[in-house]
């Protein structure tokens, strides 16, 4: 037994161009938290597969509000370590997923909303009891810097936390054949209880008489390497001294995957794809249960209905995946009609409708003129999701409440003078011009080049523009 510890050092924009936008804003302050998921071996399982070694969530970080115009800095982090306890032996090789989550603290109805900001993953070798290992991972334009280690919980010691230490029974020395438990020199290694001959380097046991192999080793005593790397002769026989497999057969020959798992060769090893309910390097471990807390984002965990399915997560609205770890982008289905803006609040969808439309999905076209009055004899005209008034002469504005100055736009051409009139405007034209707006020149012989003046009006007379 032991604890995997993860220390996040920084999360912020990575080097190079294309710095990401800050995930928070003055309108939507937010804070970060992290999730770590550990799986044994070097499996490349999908992100939603069970975190067989364990998972942990960090505390929430400090609330952050973007400074307008400033690039996204390293974002404020939660305090403390993420700790993932493991009950069994430390596998030596493990896969990790570290997710950076954003908790929005705006005025969403129903509380904060969560969204996945970045996810990094990797596979590592790590001996328990070793120093902190530092790492940098990039996800898009974001960069995550962190350190991690695995440490054993007493009385376990060793690189796999499989050796047990006990306080000395005698003050001066340990019992026959038993060594001091470095670095705990005042304790002694507990008597071996594994199967006789079980490899001390590559095997371990948790029950008396058993011999379980670390990743990369097989055989009843864990003395046979899975890879053929120690065979010298390309086509030679198996070597009893080195415990070497006959080259030729691949790592999947004989199917090392238990419980119906299927084997595939990887570039240097093999990988088992396990049926539901089983995990581990060789699908040898079963039974993730609701007690392991496998459902994220408020998913409800219930026991599976069949033996192969140890649990089922019932996800809250807005999340999906076998562990409710995927946020559903419900706005991608464009549910808001008539140009409405879609807002996914996590617990619900909201459509912000354009003027003239209403309803949960902006599906109702409002009667634009219903209850709308146009003043001063104006008439309401519907169209385009917004009402407008066609105003009587002398009035203007959205509701025809403003008295219009018809001369403000200087409508009389060629130096004509404008006079406001109860029914519009009148242009008094300068000599040589005529027309409602003084737009037509008068020919020297008295004839107009354009339509004749209305009867009863001489060129030069004031003309009323109706």
């Amino acid at each position: 037994a032991g604890v995997f510890e993860l220390q996040i050092h920084s999360f912020g924009p990575g080097p190079g161009p294309g710095a990401p936008r800050s995930p928070c804003s003055a309108r939507l302050p937010c804070r970060l938290f992290f999730r770590v998921c550990l799986k044994p071996g070097l499996s490349e399982e999908a992100a939603e597969s069970p975190c067989a070694l364990g998972a942990a969530l960090s505390a929430r970080g400090p609330v952050y509000t973007e400074q307008p115009g400033a690039p996204a800095p390293d974002l404020p982090l939660p305090d403390g370590l993420l700790q993932v306890p493991f009950r069994d032996a430390w596998p030596g090789t493990f896969s990790f997923i570290i997710e950076t989550w954003r908790e929005e603290l705006g005025d969403q109805i129903g509380g904060p909303a969560w969204s996945l900001l970045a996810r990094v993953a990797g596979r590592r070798r790590l001996a328990a009891g070793g120093p902190w290992a530092r790492d940098i991972q990039r996800a898009g334009a974001w960069e995550l810097r962190f350190s991690y280690r695995a440490r054993c919980e007493p009385p376990a010691v060793g690189t796999a936390c499989t050796r047990l230490c006990r306080p000395r029974s005698a003050p001066s020395r340990c019992g026959p054949g038993l060594r001091p438990c470095a670095p705990l020199e005042d304790e002694c290694e507990a008597p071996l209880v594994c199967r006789a001959g079980c490899s001390p380097e590559h095997g371990f046991c948790e029950q008396p008489g058993e011999c379980r192999c670390l990743e990369g080793w097989t055989g009843p005593l864990c003395t046979v390497p899975v890879s053929t790397s120690s065979c010298l002769s390309p086509r030679g026989p198996s070597s009893a001294t080195t415990g070497c497999l006959v080259p030729g057969p691949g790592p999947c020959d004989g199917n090392p995957c238990a419980n119906g798992g299927s084997c595939s060769e990887t570039p240097r090893s093999f990988e088992c794809t396990c049926p539901r309910g089983f995990y581990g390097l060789r699908c040898e471990v079963s039974g993730v249960t609701c007690a392991d807390g496998p459902c994220f984002n408020g998913g409800l965990c219930v026991g599976g209905a069949d033996p192969d399915s140890a649990y089922i997560c019932h996800c809250p609205p807005g999340f999906q995946g076998s562990n409710c770890e995927k946020r559903v982008d419900r706005c991608s289905l464009q549910p808001c009609r008539n140009g409405g803006l879609c807002l996914d609040l996590g617990h619900a969808l909201r459509c912000r409708c354009r003027a003239g439309f209403a309803g949960p999905r902006c599906e109702h076209d409002l009667d634009d003129c219903a209850g709308r009055a146009c003043a001063n004899g104006g008439t309401c005209v519907e169209g385009g999701g917004a009402h407008r008034c066609s105003c009587a002469l002398g009035f203007g504005g959205r509701d025809c409440r403003e008295r219009a100055d018809p001369c403000a736009a200087r409508p009389c051409a060629h130096g004509g003078r404008c006079y406001a009139h109860f029914s519009g405007l009148v242009c008094a034209c300068a000599p040589g011009y005529m027309g409602a707006r003084c737009e037509f020149p008068v020919h020297p012989d008295g004839a107009s080049a354009l339509p004749a003046a209305p009867p009863g009006l001489r060129p030069g007379d004031p003309q009323r523009y109706l």
């Epitope: 595939s264 990887t266 570039p267 090893s269 990988e271």
Partner: antibody
Framework: QITLKESGPTLVKPTQTLTLTCTFS??????????VGWIRQPPGKALEWLAH???????RYSPSLKSRLTITKDTSKNQVVLTMTNMDPVDTATYYC????????????????WGQGTLVTVSS | DIQMTQSPSSLSASVGDRVTITCSAS?????MYWYQQKPGKAPKLLIY???NLASGVPSRFSGSGSGTDFTLTISSLQPEDFATYYC?????????FGQGTKLEIK
């Protein structure tokens, strides 16, 4: 500077065995994490991975060709040899060798340097 | 076997265009690798581990994706970018390539 170069016969008769040698410089197959692979490309067609070998002699072969392929290395000579038995006209292709780098000694990081390739024609 | 399907198989574009090539794997892979090949030349590594630019590759190239769907993007095509592009998976043997996408000058 890392370079790889393929050598071997340019013409092979059907049923014969093809032996190709990849001679490389700028890295060593005694270095942990290093590997060399073979890839081929029939004229006008896509790339096909054939086999690779790692610094610690772990080997992988394409399942469809496994019975015909053997890959070996000579670390002291900086060479990797691929033999392919029972050649057929459909094996006519340009054969490339390439350096492969593993990260964490377990998974491929990149196949980052390639030889110029050698065209092998199978014809009677 | 994991089948790799690239789309489109060929495409015509102009200098300065933004071009996207997709690669779909028949089952989930952790990482994608992209290569560029010009006629009569060996392939050249462009992108490794899905989104990392190989040494000497211009920053106009970028890679993204996860699971079964991956993308190679060229933000602004240059004359030297007209070539055939291949994706590849290293998840399980056989370590397959896509059928290629030929990028031609419009």
């Amino acid at each position: 500077q890392i370079t790889l170069k393929e050598s071997g016969p340019t013409l092979v008769k059907p049923t014969q065995t093809l032996t190709l040698t990849c001679t490389f410089s700028g890295f060593s197959l005694s270095t942990s994490g290093m590997g060399v692979g073979w890839i081929r490309q029939p004229p006008g067609k896509a790339l096909e991975w054939l086999a690779h070998i790692w610094w610690d002699d772990v080997k992988r072969y394409s399942p469809s060709l496994k019975s015909r392929l053997t890959i070996t290395k000579d670390t002291s000579k900086n060479q990797v040899v691929l033999t392919m038995t029972n050649m057929d006209p459909v094996d006519t292709a340009t054969y490339y060798c390439a350096r492969i780098v593993s990260f964490d000694n377990d998974h491929v990081s990149a196949m980052d340097y390639w030889g110029q390739g050698t065209l092998v024609t199978v014809s009677s | 076997d994991i089948q790799m399907t690239q789309s489109p198989s060929s495409l015509s574009a102009s200098v300065g265009d933004r071009v996207t090539i997709t690669c779909s794997a028949s089952s989930s892979v952790s990482y994608m690798y992209w290569y560029q090949q010009k006629p009569g030349k060996a392939p050249k590594l462009l992108i490794y581990l899905t989104s990392n630019l190989a040494s000497g590759v211009p920053s106009r190239f970028s890679g993204s994706g996860s699971g079964t769907d991956f993308t190679l993007t060229i933000s602004s095509l240059q004359p030297e970018d007209f070539a055939t592009y291949y994706c590849q998976q290293w998840r399980s043997n056989p370590f397959t390539f896509g059928q290629g996408t030929k990028l031609e000058i419009k």
